[in-house]
Interface confidence: medium
């Protein structure tokens, strides 16, 4: 059989072959970061010759060339330095404005290894127009310099650069430009996952969020759409399984889609998910018309059942047909619900297209997009009802122009991306949905992305302190109530002197609240068993604080979910008739349950809660603690069944000042408080002035470290008595 020659090495890089040296095999070059391959690929033709795509000649020796970033073509009302034809990776460009103009955006930008500039477009603006000066991104040329209501500006890119974003923008009545900022990029450039996740996530959480659309802050540029709890979202996942997608990459497409589905169902909104795989023809694996499209297990199951081999007979990339099948699905649903009904008109639609290349058959996918926009009646007023995300994976044959044409264009948002590989895609989907943008009191939502602050990761976490030093920690369980430990209040009851420090996005120090009332468990008495030789006893170590004002929900302040409540039931996605026992069985379902608490410095530390037989062996070392319990005969006199036990294996131990803080678990991307830090046999912060320092117990310590946490499942009567009007409790 014919095979292609093997003299295809690339100097300074590597290559992979899709099907060895046989005809039909695709050779893909790759280079170290900061370099790009030229040519990017070759195809082994049936004649046994390598064909190099497009402009490059087949005989060209493959080389790794340095990535460069585009230079500014023009910069209005200011100057930039240095003035180069293009800029090397790591190179900077600086901007300054003429007198009377204020610089908006980044004064200094650096060329990154992916051929993209960091920061934001620099604009010198005097604030004269109805809309702000839209600026000119690096490498672009703008025509139109009037910024009044109805004025239009047009953009094109200098030679060899590709425009993404809107080529034309209009100044709207609300003082905002239509569409999205145009960016000129090198054809070989791609996006880093850490840029895509927040951009995609911001846009997506706007669709799921519930905030005031007029509030535009730096960290969440763009509109935020109201999806009421009664609202509905149709999510259409389109997965490319054409020949150029390897089977392994298709698996990662599926995995990424699963992550997306899992995350989307963790919002308390009504969602239907369609799954369509496509090559030459689309295959609908789940339709939004199917009642199962609302059931996460069914959706995940149909994703898992998606087979790479489903498309082995037709291996082209027919993006038009895939989008057209979405259109047909919409059309069927519209007929079913009635075009004029609210039920149809209030559905929001999001399409996520995962592809590795450009469509090469079936006509222009743009036609299908136009049909979709038409059927959904997408106009300026209804722009929020459709979002199309076009994500290209693998720099090889992805067509920037096509992706850009398909992706939605909304101010301050991006909907078209190219990622280097499927690994990067997986990273994006892992971190994209930042549910913490929600402002209602949805519980147990923490920002899990890598760049989130400690307080954003655990926004329920509060510090309780008297006027002097910090003493205890606690957890928000609603917008006005904090759950903590009773022993924090054993030295004096004048709560007017106390403050509760709650996370606040505007201040790294948080915001202080006064306490309206403290409800301390009447059963708590540290000296209750002194006459039995038990110097300290922490039974009923639980307290509630009502804050003087309600806390404004934000990325930094949000309640944790308390088990045995309707709120937690929704977050666990359990059926309506669930009981408190069901929650306990789901959350504390193993002999050793991984859990967390928050350290003095705000970081999340790991412990393992011991259950059943392991609880007994975890607790029994207390008998070796001769200082606190000099003549203890029965461990259960000290460690009652009110306590959870941790401190074995590689567990961290809480420090004295961490008492009252939540002991919590993560399930389905939501957080649930099962206990609160009460007491322990070892203080890892003893003698350490540094908040970041904790010394593990020496391996020879007797007794070994053990930590005991009030088990909230054992405190239900008391919690219900005091929080019955605040939370909706399930039957026991």
């Amino acid at each position: 059989a014919t095979s292609c020659p093997q003299n295809v090495n690339i100097s300074g890089g590597t290559f992979t072959l899709s099907h060895g040296w046989a005809p039909g095999s695709l050779l893909i070059y790759s280079c170290p970061q900061g370099l790009y391959p030229s040519p990017a690929s070759r195809l082994c033709k049936s004649s046994g010759q390598w064909q190099t795509p497009r402009a490059t000649r087949s005989l060209t020796k493959a080389v790794c060339k340095p990535v460069r970033c585009p230079a500014p073509v023009s910069f209005e009302n200011g100057i930039y330095t240095p003035r180069l034809g293009s800029y090397p990776v790591g190179g900077n460009v600086s901007f300054e404005c003429e007198d009377g103009f204020i610089l908006r955006g980044s004064p200094v930008r650096q060329c990154r290894p992916n051929g993209m500039w960091d920061g934001e477009t620099a604009v010198c603006d005097n604030g004269a127009g109805h809309c702000p000066n839209p600026g000119i991104s690096l490498g672009a040329v703008r025509t139109g310099s009037r910024f009044g209501h109805g004025d239009k500006v047009r953009y094109r890119c200098s030679s060899n650069l590709v425009l993404t974003g809107s080529a034309e923008r209009e100044c709207q009545g609300n003082g905002v430009w239509s569409g999205t900022e145009p960016i000129c990029r090198q054809p070989y450039s791609y996006d880093f996952p850490e840029d895509v996740a927040p951009a995609l996530g911001t846009s997506f959480s706007h669709m799921l969020g519930a905030t005031n659309p007029t509030q535009r802050t730096k960290e969440s540029l763009g509109r935020k759409i109201q999806i009421q709890r009664s609202g509905h979202l149709n999510l259409y996942l389109l997965l490319d399984s054409s020949q150029s997608v390897s089977e392994n990459d298709f698996l990662i497409f599926k995995e990424s889609a699963s992550l997306m589905v899992d995350r989307i169902f963790s919002f308390e909104i009504n969602v239907s998910v369609a799954i369509i795989t496509f090559a030459s023809e689309p295959k609908v694996l789940m339709s939004v018309l199917n009642v199962n499209s609302r059931d996460i297990t069914e959706v995940i199951s149909s994703l898992e059942n998606a087979k790479y081999k489903d498309h082995e007979n037709g291996t082209g990339t027919n993006t038009y047909a895939a989008l057209n099948s979405v259109y047909l699905m919409m059309n069927n649903q519209m007929q079913l619900l009635g075009m004029k009904t609210m039920a149809w008109q209030e559905i929001r639609h999001a399409i996520i297209l995962l592809t590795d290349g450009k469509s090469n058959m079936g006509g222009s996918p743009k036609t299908a997009v136009d049909q979709i926009r038409e059927i959904l009646n997408i106009n300026q007023k209804r722009n929020d009802y459709l979002d199309i995300y076009a994500i290209g994976v693998g720099k090889l044959d992805v067509d920037w122009r096509e992706l850009n044409e398909l992706g939605s264009k909304k101010d301050g948002e991006r909907h078209a991306f190219i990622l280097q590989d499927t690994k990067a895609l997986h990273q994006v989907f892992e971190h994209m949905l930042d549910v913490s943008k929600l402002t209602d009191t949805i519980c147990g939502v923490g920002n899990m992305s890598a760049n989130a602050s400690d307080q954003e990761r655990t926004p329920w976490h509060v510090t309780i302190k008297p006027k002097s030093q910090e003493t205890c920690r606690g957890a928000l369980i609603s917008d006005q109530w904090v759950l903590t430990a009773a022993h924090c209040f054993r030295d004096g009851n004048d709560h007017s002197l106390w403050r509760v420090n709650v996370g606040d996005p505007k201040s790294q120090w948080g915001k202080e609240f006064l306490i309206e009332k403290a409800v301390i468990s009447p059963g708590f008495d540290v000296f209750a068993k002194k006459n039995q030789g038990i110097l300290e006893f922490y039974g009923d170590d639980i307290a509630l604080l009502k804050l003087a004002q309600k806390v404004k929900m934000s990325t930094h302040a949000r309640p944790i979910c308390l088990p045995c409540t309707m709120e937690a039931n929704l977050a666990l996605r359990r059926p309506q008739g669930s009981t408190c026992r069901d929650h306990e069985n789901e959350l504390l379902n193993k002999q050793s349950v991984p859990a967390h608490f928050v350290a003095l410095n705000g970081s999340k530390l790991n412990i393992n809660l011991k259950m059943g037989v392991e609880w007994t062996s975890c607790a029994e070392v207390v008998s070796q603690e001769k200082t606190m319990f000099p003549n203890l005969t029965d461990v259960r006199e000290v460690v009652t069944d009110q306590f959870l036990c941790s401190g074995t294996q590689e567990d961290e131990s809480p420090c004295k000042g961490e008492s009252g803080g939540a002991v919590f678990l993560e399930r389905r991307f939501r957080f649930f408080q099962v206990g609160l830090v009460s007491w322990g046999l070892y203080n890892p912060c003893l003698g350490s002035a540094d908040k970041n320092s904790r010394k593990r117990a020496p391996r020879s310590k007797v007794p070994p470290p053990r930590d005991f946490h009030i088990n909230l499942f054992r405190m239900q009567p008391w919690l219900r008595q005091h929080l019955g009007d605040v939370l909706n409790f399930l039957p026991l």
Epitope: K695, P698, S700, K701, V702
Partner: antibody, heavy 118, light 111 residues
Framework: EVQLVQSGAEVKKPGASVKVSCKAS????????MDWVRQATGQGLEWIGD????????GYNQKFKGRATMTVNKSISTAYMELSSLRSEDTAVYYC???????????WGQGTLVTVSS | DNVLTQSPDSLAVSLGERATISCRAS??????????MHWYQQKPGQPPKLLIY???NLKSGVPDRFSGSGSGTDFTLTISSLQAEDAATYYC?????????FGQGTKLEIK
């Protein structure tokens, strides 16, 4: 004052076993782990393993697992290390060392020279 | 196992001069906010003696010309002004997890 006193020098034939003792005084024996470290002439230090006298739990360097056995007699505050199937390369000074609160070896015995020779 | 590599293997320093010994670990020895790296001095015919614990803490009774620094995988023992009695072999040792390991030792001589 903390003191660790080890047993005297031993000469053994290849294939035999040796048991070195380490008597502790000046602190509560069960409060700290006891470690065993050896040093061949002109060579560096090599950790053999440790024992928690309270629980009699042990941790071994894989290299010695199966050949080294560490035990304690709490009533006389003494730790023991037995090494079996001796070979000539086991000729070394064997030290017991007491761990402190930082898992460092704060106190050392004077050492026991074990010579393996046919 | 965590391999500790000391450098140099030996060095000669004049009295009153500064001596610096490095120890590099193949894996981080940091946990719970502390670096579980310790330094010992050993003179011929004697057992080792603990000088520095947890990377930078001077054991009581040890002269303050000895100091330790470093974090994660790279550590340094410094003798600020060398005295005659400091001629010895110095070892680093980690106790981050089992098995504990020692560096190969650095022999310090007076020039």
């Amino acid at each position: 004052e903390v003191q660790l006193v080890q047993s005297g020098a031993e000469v053994k034939k290849p294939g035999a076993s040796v048991k070195v003792s380490c008597k502790a005084s000046g602190y509560t024996f069960t409060d700290y782990n006891m470690d065993w470290v050896r040093q061949a002439t002109g060579q560096g230090l090599e950790w053999i393993g440790d024992i928690n006298p309270n629980y009699e739990s042990t941790g071994y360097n894989q290299k010695f697992k199966g050949r080294a056995t560490m035990t304690v007699n709490k009533s006389i505050s003494t730790a023991y290390m037995e090494l079996s199937s001796l070979r000539s390369e086991d000729t070394a000074v064997y030290y017991c060392a007491r761990e402190d609160d930082h898992d460092a070896f704060a106190y050392w015995g004077q050492g026991t020279l074990v010579t393996v020779s046919s | 196992d965590n391999v500790l590599t000391q450098s140099p293997d030996s060095l000669a320093v004049s009295l009153g001069e500064r001596a610096t010994i490095s120890c590099r670990a193949s894996k981080s020895v940091r946990t719970s906010g502390y670096n579980y790296m310790h330094w010992y001095q050993q003179k011929p015919g004697q057992p080792p003696k603990l000088l520095i614990y947890l990377a930078s803490n001077l054991k009581s009774g040890v002269p303050d010309r000895f100091s330790g620094s470093g974090s994660g995988t790279d550590f340094t023992l410094t003798i600020s002004s060398l005295q005659a009695e400091d001629a010895a072999t110095y070892y680093c040792q980690h106790s981050r997890e089992l098995p504990y390991t020692f560096g190969q030792g650095t022999k310090l001589e007076i020039k």
